[in-house]
Each structure stands twice: as structure tokens, then as C-alpha cells.
């Protein structure tokens, strides 16, 4: 049966690989981050914000954030030539649950942890921050970049990838096995790149009520009659019921909600209240915590970060601190344990084990891989041509083909423009990163779907504000030209 991605499911993961960090070229560059300070080590923080607008530095990382492990300890040798600075191992990964926006701001911070004789333990300071506004389609190759921040130079690569069953450049399409071999269900198309599968309905906004909400476009949440609220979880009051409280009104026959746990907002100090079954939960602003955000005046010296969280900033009671939580914990003070197994990451009936520091999947016989994603029989000895990858499932192999190729074994050249995806006379180009539309004058959008009024405003509210007429809204990747 077709189903929407549930609130807990991941749409995908943004991945960042730091290649090098060190003094930039030219005079005046520092020899090392530890000069005259004793030993130190580096770590990185990545912050993702949606859209391409210049957002205030303190605005939240609405798409997510992640913190690297600490790098190896580095001690400067005064006479020796400056080596490459040792970096933390591994990728920085930022999971996202909603559609990948394609346009985003990427903020990478390099932090120094000084390990000298600090009163109260190590000291942290921000060495460099780079901010790049980028277009990036999910599912493409690694994009490479080099950025300078003051006297420092950072080299890195990044990509966004979807977590199956989500696919597409925004991770908004779902693939499900076909109900019949020859066709998909009503209104559903074959699901590129997995042509053997069918597209599921669009992915609604995270948290949209499965009983009372629905969506026609990814990321929206439209309510059935009688329900309201951003997630369609609030019973709607009809005009004749206004002013009444209690479970129902015999005179009007309409249902009205009783007192809710968030009525009157029990969260202090600007905290926001969200209802939970039979109770409520406060999300506290920086500098406050507690059940009702009632605890304040906290600094990092008070140790507000639980479960091994890293406290940054907040040197005095007037400045806010931030807790960077280790994997498996969340909340403004890392007080909430994430039940990562609720995301059902183990495929093919594998058993999920949350070990705290890591997730493990115990696979059923015949399956293997970190998430039990490999069917040991399906892809053995099968080759997908032209850079395609073998995808297992249902006892039969199929190929997920690289851009520009199709067919069972990816041997057929596919033209991404063959379906004429650019509306209103727009031109489609078979760019290496995916199709690109150049719109005819008077139209805009990634598929030229929005007419532009003479005042430069799109006729549809779905068009992002500030978009120029004819803006392709497309995303690219650094890659070789074919």
C-alpha cells in the first residue's frame, strides 16, 4: 500500500568532507592556529540555512547543523616548516526530514580548542567562518570548493543525497514497487531513476496529520474539513461555536476543543509550547532551560549541557550559550535522547540496535550492509554499465543509472529533455548536472511553470519571493563536461 514518508523518516543527508584547513597564501598568514598558546586541536561546525538570502548570522540553522569530532592534538614546532593542520576524521552529516531545498546557505565554522593550562578546562574560540550561498541538487556528485576566511583557507567537498525510498533532486518523490508489472496506480508515474517502481504521493510537511491532513505538493499540509493548524492537528471551530468551551454544544451540534495543555503558554522566557499526548513540551530559547524554560542566567561554567554535549559561548550570564549535542541526543541542553531506531533505518526486516555512540543493524539471513540494504543474491555478478549502480530487492536486480543513461543495464542513452519538461516554450538543456530550463520571456521557475506579471511578481504564491523573471532556479555540481 502507498504511504507517505512518516514524520520520523529521513528524506536525506547533507554530507561535508573537509580536505584541508590552514594558512592561506600570501604574506601575513599565521603559521598555525596554536601560536604561542600551547597545544590545540581543531573541530568544525556546519550550519545549513534554506534559501539564498543573506540571513543574519544568528538566525537558526533551519536545515540542520552538525559538529565534527575533535582533530588530533597539534603543537607548533617553532623552527619546523608549518605542516598541514591535522583534521578530524570522517564526514560531517546533517540529516534532513523535509524536502531538500536546492538553494541554501552553507556556513562552516572552524573552532580551536586550546589544551593549555586553562582554568576550568579547555577553552574554545572561533577561528574562521565561511558562508557560501549555493545551489545543489540532491543525488548529484560531490561539489568541491575552496574558501578563504581572513588569513585562513578551507578546502572542502559537499553533496546532498536522498535516503531511499526518497528520490529526486529534492528527495520529495517516493519509490514503491509497482502493483502491476505494466502500469502504476492512478495518477502516479514511473519513478526515475528506479523505473521499475512507481512514484508515491508527494511528501507532506513533516508532522502533517496522516488522518486529517493531505498534500498535493511536497512540503505542504492541507487540512480536511473540520481541522486546522499548520499540521491539521487542531479541531476547527465553526462560527456558530465561537465562545463556547467544552467537549460539545448540544445547541449547535458542533465539536469544540476543550482546554489544551498549551493554553496560556506555560513556557516562560519566550519558550514555545507544543502539545504532546496528555501533556506539553517547551522549546527554550538560548540561555534558558527546564520544564518551563524557567532556569536562566546559566553559563558554560554551570555545565548546562547534558549527555556529553559541548558548551560553546556563554562566558557570562548575559550572553547565551549553545549546546552541541553528541549523536543520539538533542534539545537545547542535549537532554532528550533520540530513539534513532524509531527511524527504522534497518532495511529488509533487520533488527535495529541503538548503542548510543552508533547504530547497528542485525541483518536477516540473505542480507548485509550497514543498513541491511544489500541482498546478497541480487547483485552478485551483475554489472550496470556507464556508472550505474546495482539496487537489490525482491530477488531481482535492477540498475540505478547515472545521469544520461537508462534501460535495465544502463546501456541506453537517455535524454533528460525528451519529455519536454520546460513549459511555455522554455528551452531544455542536457547539462551534466541534470536538465536545465531557460525560460521564454515572461515565464520563470525551474520548469518555466510560473507566468510573470508585468510588475515582476509571479502569478503563483509558490514562486520564491525575489526571483527574477527567467530565473532557472536550477542547481549544479562541479563535474567534468561530457
Amino acid at each position: 500500500e502507498q504511504k507517505l514518508i512518516s514524520e520520523e523518516d529521513l528524506a536525506g543527508v547533507f554530507e561535508l568532507q573537509i580536505h584541508s584547513f590552514g594558512p592561506g597564501p600570501g604574506p601575513g598568514a599565521p603559521r598555525s592556529p596554536c601560536s604561542a598558546r600551547g597545544p590545540c586541536r581543531l573541530f568544525f561546525r556546519v550550519c545549513l540555512k534554506p534559501g539564498l538570502s543573506e540571513e543574519a548570522a544568528e538566525s537558526p540553522c533551519a536545515l540542520g547543523a552538525a559538529l565534527s569530532a575533535r582533530g588530533p592534538v597539534y603543537t607548533e614546532q617553532p623552527e619546523a616548516p608549518a605542516p598541514d593542520l591535522p583534521l578530524p576524521n570522517g564526514l560531517l552529516q546533517v540529516p534532513f526530514r523535509d524536502a531538500w531545498p536546492g538553494t541554501f546557505s552553507l556556513i562552516i565554522e572552524t573552532w580551536r580548542e586550546e589544551l593549555g593550562d586553562q582554568i576550568g578546562g579547555p577553552a574554545w574560540s572561533l577561528l574562521a567562518r565561511v558562508t557560501r550561498r549555493r545551489r545543489l541538487a540532491a543525488g548529484g556528485p560531490w561539489a568541491r570548493d575552496i574558501q578563504r576566511a581572513g588569513a585562513w583557507e578551507l578546502r572542502f567537498s559537499y553533496r546532498a543525497r536522498c535516503e531511499l525510498p526518497a528520490v529526486g533532486t529534492a528527495c520529495t518523490r517516493l519509490c514503491r514497487p509497482r502493483s502491476a508489472p505494466s502500469r502504476c496506480g492512478p495518477g502516479l508515474r514511473p519513478c526515475a531513476p528506479l523505473e521499475d517502481e512507481c512514484e508515491a504521493p508527494p511528501v507532506c510537511r513533516a508532522g502533517c496529520s496522516l488522518e486529517h491532513g493531505f498534500c498535493e505538493q511536497p512540503g505542504e499540509c492541507r487540512c480536511l474539513e473540520g481541522w486546522t493548524g499548520p499540521l491539521c492537528t487542531v479541531p476547527a471551530s465553526t462560527s456558530s461555536c465561537l465562545g463556547l468551551r467544552g467537549p460539545s454544544s448540544a445547541t449547535t451540534g458542533c465539536l469544540v476543543p476543550g482546554p489544551g495543555p498549551c493554553d496560556g503558554n506555560p513556557c516562560a522566557n519566550g519558550g514555545s509550547c507544543s502539545e504532546t499526548p496528555g501533556s506539553f513540551e517547551c522549546t527554550c530559547p538560548r540561555g534558558f532551560y527546564g520544564l518551563r524554560c524557567e532556569v536562566s542566567g546559566v553559563t558554560c561554567a554551570d555545565g548546562p549541557c547534558f549527555n556529553g554535549g559541548l558548551c560553546v559561548g556563554g562566558a557570562d550570564p548575559d550572553s547565551a550559550y549553545i549546546c552541541h549535542c553528541p549523536p543520539g541526543f538533542q534539545g537545547s541542553n542535549c537532554e532528550k535522547r533520540v530513539d534513532r531506531c524509531s527511524l527504522q533505518p534497518c532495511r529488509n526486516g533487520g533488527l535495529c540496535l541503538d548503542l548510543g555512540h552508533a547504530l547497528r543493524c542485525r541483518c536477516r539471513a540473505g542480507f548485509a550492509g550497514p543498513r541491511c540494504e544489500h541482498n546478497l543474491d541480487d547483485c552478485a555478478g551483475r554489472a550496470c554499465a556507464n556508472g550505474g549502480t546495482c539496487v537489490e530487492g525482491g530477488g531481482a536486480h535492477r540498475c540505478s543509472c547515472a545521469l544520461g543513461f537508462g534501460g535495465r543495464d544502463c546501456r541506453e542513452r537517455a535524454d533528460p529533455c525528451a519529455a519536454r519538461p520546460c513549459a511555455h516554450g522554455g528551452r531544455c538543456y542536457a547539462h551534466f548536472s541534470g536538465l536545465v530550463c531557460a525560460c521564454a520571456p515572461g515565464y520563470m521557475g525551474s520548469r518555466c511553470e510560473f507566468p510573470v506579471h508585468p510588475d515582476g511578481v509571479s502569478a503563483l504564491p509558490a514562486a520564491p519571493p525575489g526571483l527574477r523573471p527567467g530565473d532557472p532556479q536550477r542547481h549544479h555540481h562541479h563535474h567534468h563536461h561530457h
Epitope: A440, P469, G470, D471, H482
Partner: antibody, heavy 119, light 110 residues
Framework: QVTLRESGPALVKPTQTLTLTCTFS?????????MGWVRQAPGQGLEWMGT????????DYASWAKGRVTISVDTSKNQFSLKLSSVTAADTAVYYC???????????WGQGTLVTVSS | DIQLTQSPSFLSASVGDRVTITCQST????????LSWYQQKPGQPPKLLIY???NLEIGVPSRFSGSGSGTDFTLTINSLEAEDAATYYC??????????FGGGTKVEIK
């Protein structure tokens, strides 16, 4: 190997029509591109002449070239061609064919062919 | 007609210098960033350096960078090297499927 190669006469007389051919290999016009012609007079800058869009074979020309330039495609021979009518000495230039695959840039160029207009 | 104006038309600089070339268009380029930069050496076709205003083409040294949007764009060579002696062109793509090149900037090594 994806390549473009221009060919045609090195010398043309004034008032005649210049015909140049661009032969491509390593890709097919079944995908959608702009195939364009760009010229460069000796010691001068680059000048866009026109393009043909392989999605529907529509053509676009620089304003100065309209009425003088015709670009067409022969898919069976993997070629596209440029016709420039009523040439004068001012049309003496290196002529390049180039391919655009999106985002407005020519990512693939031929080596160019020098055409001299002289009687 | 759309005009792309490059300045300066000629510059002489020393190895290690930071060089900046500007490109101004009489109309906004398509999507506000469909502008590219090329390097051309005598007897060779142009070589793509930067596309979409700021994206470095694969294989191009990182000392080259591009910025700008709409009508005003900049190419920067951070630390000039001898092999960078060449002529540099900007090129825009415009609504209505037209292209235009700048007049070029010749960079000479002192």
C-alpha cells in the same frame, strides 16, 4: 572523446556566400544543446553570431547577423553549418563552433578556422 | 543591443599580484548569474574558467575566482602567475536566448 572541428574555405571573394561546417563527435544531437558560431577578427574580441537549438532546431542570431547568417543541422552526418552571405573584408576572422549545454556558457569549442575575404 | 563592457582593456602586473577585471552588462543576465569567464591565448580557442558567475570549472587553478550578479561581475586572479598572461573575456546569456561577449582584457606580466 567529445570534439568539434570546423572546416571550409580559407579564402572567399567579396560578395560571395561563406559556408562553414562543424563536425562533432562523442555526442549526439538527440540530446538538447545550443550549437553556436562565434568569430574573432584578427586582433579583436570574440563575437557571437548565432545558435541553433537542437531540441526543436530553432535559431537565434545576433542583431547584426539577422538576414545575413543561416545556421542549420544535418543530424545524419553529425554536422551543423554556417552560411554568411555578401561577405566583405570585414568578415575576415577565425570562426569557431561551440556547444552550450546549460547555464549560458560554451563549455566545448572547436579549434577554429581562419577565413580571409579578399579578391 | 546588449553591451558587455570590460575594464580595464589592458593591464600589466607582476607575478604574485592580485588582479581584478570587471564586467558590466547593460541588461541583467538570465537568472542573474548566467555569466561566464574565459581565458584565451594566441592561436587557441577560449578556455572556460568560471561559469554561473562564481563556479570554478574543473581543472582551473583556485587562484581564479568570480563574483557578482545581475549586471555587475568581477574576475579575480589572486596571485598572478606567468602562465596567466592572456586575454580574458566575460560572456553573458540573456532572456530571449541571446549571448554577448565583453571586449576583452589583455593581461601582461611585467
Amino acid at each position: 572523446q567529445v570534439t568539434l572541428r570546423e572546416s571550409g574555405p580559407a579564402l572567399v571573394k567579396p560578395t560571395q556566400t561563406l559556408t562553414l561546417t562543424c563536425t562533432f563527435s562523442g555526442f549526439s544531437l538527440s540530446s538538447s544543446y545550443d550549437m553556436g558560431w562565434v568569430r574573432q577578427a584578427p586582433g579583436q574580441g570574440l563575437e557571437w553570431m548565432g545558435t541553433i537549438y537542437t531540441g526543436d532546431y530553432s535559431t537565434d542570431y545576433a542583431s547584426w547577423a539577422k538576414g545575413r547568417v543561416t545556421i542549420s543541422v544535418d543530424t545524419s552526418k553529425n554536422q551543423f553549418s554556417l552560411k554568411l552571405s555578401s561577405v566583405t573584408a570585414a568578415d575576415t576572422a577565425v570562426y569557431y563552433c561551440a556547444r552550450h549545454t546549460g547555464y549560458g556558457y560554451f563549455g566545448l569549442w572547436g579549434q577554429g578556422t581562419l577565413v580571409t575575404v579578399s579578391s | 543591443d546588449i553591451q558587455l563592457t570590460q575594464s580595464p582593456s589592458f593591464l600589466s602586473a607582476s607575478v604574485g599580484d592580485r588582479v581584478t577585471i570587471t564586467c558590466q552588462s547593460t541588461e541583467s543576465v538570465y537568472g542573474s548569474d548566467w555569466l561566464s569567464w574565459y581565458q584565451q591565448k594566441p592561436g587557441q580557442p577560449p578556455k572556460l574558467l568560471i561559469y554561473q558567475a562564481s563556479n570554478l570549472e574543473i581543472g582551473v587553478p583556485s587562484r581564479f575566482s568570480g563574483s557578482g550578479s545581475g549586471t555587475d561581475f568581477t574576475l579575480t586572479i589572486n596571485s598572478l602567475e606567468a602562465e596567466d598572461a592572456a586575454t580574458y573575456y566575460c560572456q553573458g546569456y540573456y532572456s530571449g536566448y541571446s549571448y554577448a561577449f565583453g571586449g576583452g582584457t589583455k593581461v601582461e606580466i611585467k
